[in-house]
Interface confidence: medium
């Protein structure tokens, strides 16, 4: 969480941003809130990015003003226009690119004053893993697959029964480059698994951490997976 205050001159207003991460190829949100104003026409929102000459986005007089938008963001940005009046200046970024990573500034002008705050935006790829029993294998084997990751993650297996055990000797992980030549498919195989145990396949890079769990019993297989973005650092 980053809270910024205004610049000298007129009164300052509080602007708050939250560091976040974008999944390349998908849409992302850059979060920014400010002390609201009663009149929409008095609010100016400018998003800027370090290393980019033009504006990322501008909203003023109640509508988007895209005249000075930098070429690299053309057609890819929008604010939540109906929420600006209540102090939401968050930016929707379409089709997130690897190059969108960096430091952004949310700059606000209202009738009360000015303020700005920086936001660190990370980009990469992350996806939910799915763990299945590999029936084609000669021994009891689990296969953990996740379609899109970048940068290359680490993969660690764990089990409920053998807590603290190191499975690196009985697992094999491969990374296969996807067709767009950036993201990779993650495949990890765990050998010699035992029945009536819960196994977890944990995939992590500096942007996200995802876990796929599988519980194998004689009568059923239960799966569960979840993903957590590692974006809560304050600075």
């Amino acid at each position: 969480l980053i809270i910024g205050f205004g610049i000298s001159g007129r009164h300052s207003i509080t602007v708050t941003t939250v560091a976040s991460a974008g999944n390349i190829g998908e849409d992302g949100i850059l979060s920014c809130t400010f002390e609201p104003d009663i009149k929409l026409s008095d609010i100016v929102i400018q998003w800027l990015k370090e290393g980019v000459l033009g504006l990322v986005h501008e909203f003023k007089e109640g509508k988007d003003e895209l005249s000075e938008q930098d070429e690299m963001f053309r057609g890819r940005t929008a604010v939540f226009a109906d929420q600006v009046i209540v102090g939401n200046a968050s930016l929707r970024l379409k089709n997130v690119q690897l190059t969108d990573a960096g430091t952004y500034k949310c700059y606000i002008i209202t009738s009360k004053g000015k303020g700005n705050a920086n936001l660190e935006y990370k980009t990469g790829a992350f996806s939910m893993p799915e763990v299945n029993v590999d029936y084609n294998a000669s021994s009891e084997t689990l296969r953990c697959e996740a379609p899109r990751w970048f940068p290359q993650p680490t993969v660690v297996w764990a089990s409920q029964v053998d807590q603290g055990a190191n499975f690196s000797e009985v697992s094999n992980t491969s990374f296969e480059l996807n067709s767009e030549n950036v993201t990779m498919k993650v495949v990890s195989v765990l050998y010699n698994v035992t029945i009536n145990n819960t196994y977890s396949c944990m995939i992590e890079n500096d942007i996200a951490k995802a876990t796929g769990d599988i519980k194998v019993t004689e009568s059923e297989i239960k799966r569960r997976s979840h993903l957590q973005l590692l974006n809560s650092k304050a600075s």
Epitope: E50, V52, L53, L66, G75, Y107
Partner: antibody, heavy 116, light 113 residues
């Protein structure tokens, strides 16, 4: 009303550097791009580069890459353009301009003469 | 880089007559999502900085007399002075701001015939 006021004329020797200033008054300096354009005697307009003062982000024209440095000081609302390794062909009037729907406000120009 | 080519290089027009300057860009300056052409026209008198006349190819700058008008879209643009006045003697430049590097036309000198 915004105004851009540039520093005075300079006479420089070949191989030396020149630093021209451009002071803005009357409006928000930080979130407008400031660009530098030069005009050799009897010639057209040539874009050199620009800066977004709030981040100090710059972009330069290929022909000036490595020789030109554009900076900005938010506290004084002043942009600077420094050109190094001067040669006689750099004799020109140097303008700063604010980008806003094209370039809507221009400085008065600074004449730089490069002569041995 | 986008190349801007103006024609003619110079133009002599009688007072009160129409002056027309053309500008051609090597690629389209129309940005469809906002339906605007990123083209500007400037007037420059000797010893003075350029003055913005027209932006978005057809929008007059503040304080610009209505005898100046801009038209065109995509790659072909025109600046028209409907009735030339003595104070219009100057050099006129077109400029694209669609992408960096920002580029200018070579200029058209307008004189009185």
């Amino acid at each position: 009303q915004v105004q851009l006021v540039q520093s005075g004329a300079e006479v420089k020797k070949p191989g030396s550097s020149v630093k021209v200033s451009c002071k803005a008054s009357g409006d928000t300096f930080t979130t407008y791009q400031i660009h530098w354009v030069r005009q050799a005697p009897g010639q057209g307009l040539e874009w050199m580069g620009g800066i977004m003062p709030i981040f100090g982000t710059t972009k330069y024209a290929q022909n000036f890459q490595g020789r030109v440095t554009i900076t900005a000081d938010e506290s004084t609302s002043t942009a600077y353009m420094e050109l190094s390794s001067l040669r006689s062909e750099d004799t020109a009037v140097y303008y700063c301009a604010r980008r806003n729907y094209g370039m809507d406000v221009w400085g008065q120009g600074t004449t730089v003469t490069v002569s041995s | 880089d986008i190349v801007m080519t103006q024609s003619p290089d110079s133009l002599a027009v009688s007072l009160g007559e129409r002056a027309t300057i053309n500008c051609k860009s090597s690629q389209s300056l129309l940005y469809r999502p906002v339906n605007k052409n990123f083209l500007a026209w400037y007037q420059q008198k000797p010893g003075q900085p350029p003055k913005l006349l027209i932006y978005w190819a057809s929008t007059r700058g503040s304080g610009v007399p209505d005898r100046f008008s801009g038209s065109g879209s995509g790659t072909d643009f025109t600046l028209t002075i409907s009735s030339l006045q003595a104070e219009d003697v100057a050099t006129y430049f077109c400029q694209q701001y669609y992408s960096t590097p920002i580029t200018f036309g070579q200029g058209t000198k307008v004189e009185i015939k």
